[in-house]
């Protein structure tokens, strides 16, 4: 959402979010690190190209032309400088002058040593309990953002991990149309469209960076869960990793896992949709998880097959019209899991990413809540690894990522909601090792061809 320094009456009224880096002679004297040449305060560039007609409520949602409903000026950073005040480095760079290349390795969670596994679990738990040092979240829409008295910004502190959950919630929430009117649900700024992979890539990159800074460990990396096992068991659901099943309630996590103590945020959907409020930092009930336990839907009781990944990587077009969850021969729609692994759309199909979520059968299978289950992180790092392999194989061919007429939020140059500073889908449509400072340690299955006798 927004930096704490910008959650003020002055910043919101002026529309300027250009915090100082190292002000020597009073506030406003080093906006965006301008005195050291790191950046400058400039007008926000927001995509104004048309979106698909599926969203008919232009003017009613704060997420339109993001982030202009809140701010129209932000920091534009030079070279490898980055961040809300140009005080950090672009992904893949570090050092005081952001001139040292960095490459971290994301590895299979199951391949980590016992100490590394423990380190990761403890780091997640620390992120759940550590207030985000930079960002605060809005608890009201823009028209109510200054409170009933017009002078009290409606923002709250939130933990690093809950911020990760909140940003996802905010991207998928319904459009509030007013008290007494039904909220509009055919909108999603991070799923069912071309931005699915780029949005989730930045989402993970932000969490990884936040955790690196929390730990002051630049080499910290998020592992992945290779969910394409074809099994009907969750191999990472053990107490030393993501938590086994509770013996007392099959939908809960074992009390021997730290994750049994976690409480979810953003669960009061009815309030948000009827009152027009936003999810806040209040934690509610426990994580629910019942892997392979949805007996009513046998098709989601088994994880994707290894060959499903090999097949989806042969779909050579990134996306295809209508750039939605019914696209055929679209790599994005295939890995997202609305098409079968060969790329053929079938309304009954749930494969790959979607199937992995639904397999978890609980918190992790509900879109507005899913990141509350930390398996989300591992599921999406694997999805991102598949994306990165596609980018490598097909030379990051962006030609079929639409510039316009995608679902709202999904045009190529749209600023991904609700990230700050503004970041477009294009910026994430690049090979990670060369451009984003991370790589995956992974072996991809090759397609098995049957030779006719």
């Amino acid at each position: 959402q927004f930096p704490r320094q910008c959650a003020t009456v002055e910043a919101l009224r002026s529309g300027m979010c250009c915090p100082d880096l190292s002000p020597v002679s009073g506030p406003g004297t080093d906006r965006c690190g301008s005195s050291s040449g790191r950046g400058r305060c400039e007008a926000v560039t927001a995509d104004s190209r048309p979106h698909s007609p599926q969203y008919p409520h232009d003017g009613r949602d704060d997420r339109e032309v993001w982030p202009l409903r809140f701010f129209n000026r932000t920091c534009h950073c030079n070279g490898n400088f980055s961040g809300h005040n140009c005080g950090t480095c672009r992904p893949g760079w570090r050092g005081a002058a952001c001139d040292q290349r960095v490459l971290i390795v994301r590895r299979n969670l199951l391949d980590l040593s016992k100490e590394e596994k423990n380190h990761f679990v403890r780091a997640l738990d620390m992120a759940k309990r550590t207030t985000h040092p930079l960002f605060v979240i809005a608890t009201r829409r823009s028209e109510e953002i200054l409170g009933p008295d017009g002078n009290t910004p409606q923002f709250e502190n939130i933990s690093i991990y809950n911020y990760f959950v909140w940003t996802h919630y905010y991207s998928v929430k319904k459009t509030f149309l007013g008290v007494g009117q039904e909220s509009f649900g055919e909108v999603d700024f991070s799923h069912e469209g071309p931005a699915f992979l780029t949005w989730h890539r930045y989402h993970l990159l932000r969490l990884e960076k936040d955790m690196q800074e929390m730990l002051q460990e630049p080499s910290f990396s998020l592992p992945y869960w290779n969910f394409a096992t074809g099994k009907n068991v969750c191999d990472i659901c053990t107490d030393d990793l993501m938590g086994s099943r509770s013996n007392f309630d099959s939908t809960l996590i074992s009390p021997n896992s730290v994750f049994s103590q976690w409480r979810v945020v953003c669960d009061s959907l009815e309030d948000y949709d009827t009152l027009g409020t936003l999810c806040n930092s209040t934690e509610d009930g426990p994580i629910r998880r019942n892997p392979a336990g949805n007996v009513a839907r046998p098709m989601v009781q088994r994880l994707p097959e290894p060959q499903d990944v090999a097949q989806c990587l042969e779909v050579g077009l990134f996306d295809t019209p209508p750039f939605y969850s019914n696209s055929t021969n679209s790599f994005r729609n295939t890995v997202e899991g609305y098409s079968d692994p060969t790329g053929k759309y079938d309304p009954a199909v749930r494969s790959l990413h979607n199937l992995a979520h639904l397999f978890l059968n609980g918190t992790g299978g509900q879109t507005h809540l899913s990141p509350n289950d930390p398996i989300f992180v591992l599921l999406h790092t694997f999805t991102d690894a598949v994306f990165d392999e596609w980018l490598r194989r097909y030379n990051a061919d962006i030609s079929t990522f639409p510039l316009e007429n995608a679902p709202i939020g999904h045009n190529r140059q749209y600023n991904m909601v609700p990230f700050w500073p503004p970041v477009t889908n294009t910026e994430m449509f690049v090979t990670a090792p060369d451009n984003l400072g991370y790589t995956y340690e992974i072996q991809w299955p090759s397609r098995e061809f049957s030779v006719p006798e």
Epitope: A96, S113, K114, E115, E116, N118, H119, R122, A123, T130, P133, E213, M214, L215, Q216, E217, P218, S219
Partner: antibody, heavy 119, light 107 residues
Framework: QVQLVQSGSELKKPGASVKISCKAS????????MNWVRQAPGQGLESMGW????????TYAQGFTGRFVFSMDTSVSTAYLQISSLKAEDTAIYYC????????????WGQGTLVTVSS | EIVLTQSPATLSLSPGERATLSCRAS??????LAWYQQKPGQAPRLLIY???NRATGIPARFSGSGSGTDFTITISSLEPEDFAVYYC?????????FGQGTKLEIK
């Protein structure tokens, strides 16, 4: 070059408090976590915990919660260790050491501050 | 909590001889192990990190090996300045544990 200069030796009575300083130079103070290590006379090294110099968030090792407080002042690139309700068993040399490399090891150390607790 | 046990407690050797010091972890620490040297009245000095990498400025006579639970530091030919106390150290969840130390003394 990286340097860590700690405050001088202290002689304190049981029940008193002490605040040790560790001034860093030669690097960006807020870029690297600061660790504190204790060494009782003739004994080995014992990790006390660390402070995130970017956020001020402390992490304490078992046995070092309650009477021990890590703090810092970024304007003077200095980390502090305060010990209250001193006991005889707190007599030790206290070292500060930034986690300067990305590998989590301690490649630079302060010279140490001897705290003696005696009535 | 991971416990590091060093052996021997004391090692008496002469200059020019080869020294081998051991460190055993109560459970696997992968290769997250370091060795430090401490001389009387001085702060510890990093010698080896990640089990086998020499820190900047450390002479080639120092070498480290091992992974998992068993680690060794070897000094191929002892110099007079090498007689000191040696500690192994592992990182676990941002907190360190050290071995109890091995004193390397002149025979």
């Amino acid at each position: 070059q990286v340097q860590l200069v700690q405050s001088g030796s202290e002689l304190k009575k049981p029940g008193a408090s002490v605040k040790i300083s560790c001034k860093a130079s030669g690097y960006t103070f807020t870029s690297y976590a600061m660790n504190w290590v204790r060494q009782a006379p003739g004994q080995g090294l014992e990790s006390m915990g660390w402070i995130n110099t970017n956020t001020g968030n402390p992490t304490y090792a078992q046995g070092f919660t309650g009477r021990f407080v890590f703090s810092m002042d970024t304007s003077v690139s200095t980390a502090y260790l305060q010990i209250s309700s001193l006991k005889a068993e707190d007599t030790a040399i206290y070292y500060c050491a930034p986690r300067y490399s990305s590998s989590w090891y301690l490649d630079y150390w302060g010279q140490g501050t001897l705290v003696t607790v005696s009535s | 909590e991971i416990v590091l046990t060093q052996s021997p407690a004391t090692l008496s050797l002469s200059p020019g001889e080869r020294a081998t010091l051991s460190c055993r972890a109560s459970q696997s620490v992968s290769s997250y192990l370091a060795w430090y040297q401490q001389k009387p009245g001085q702060a510890p000095r990093l010698l080896i990190y990640d089990a086998s990498n020499r820190a900047t400025g450390i002479p080639a006579r120092f070498s480290g090996s091992g992974s998992g639970t068993d680690f060794t530091i070897t000094i191929s030919s002892l110099e007079p300045e090498d007689f000191a106390v040696y500690y192994c150290q592992q990182r676990s969840n941002w907190l360190y544990t050290f071995g109890q130390g091995t004193k390397l003394e002149i025979k």
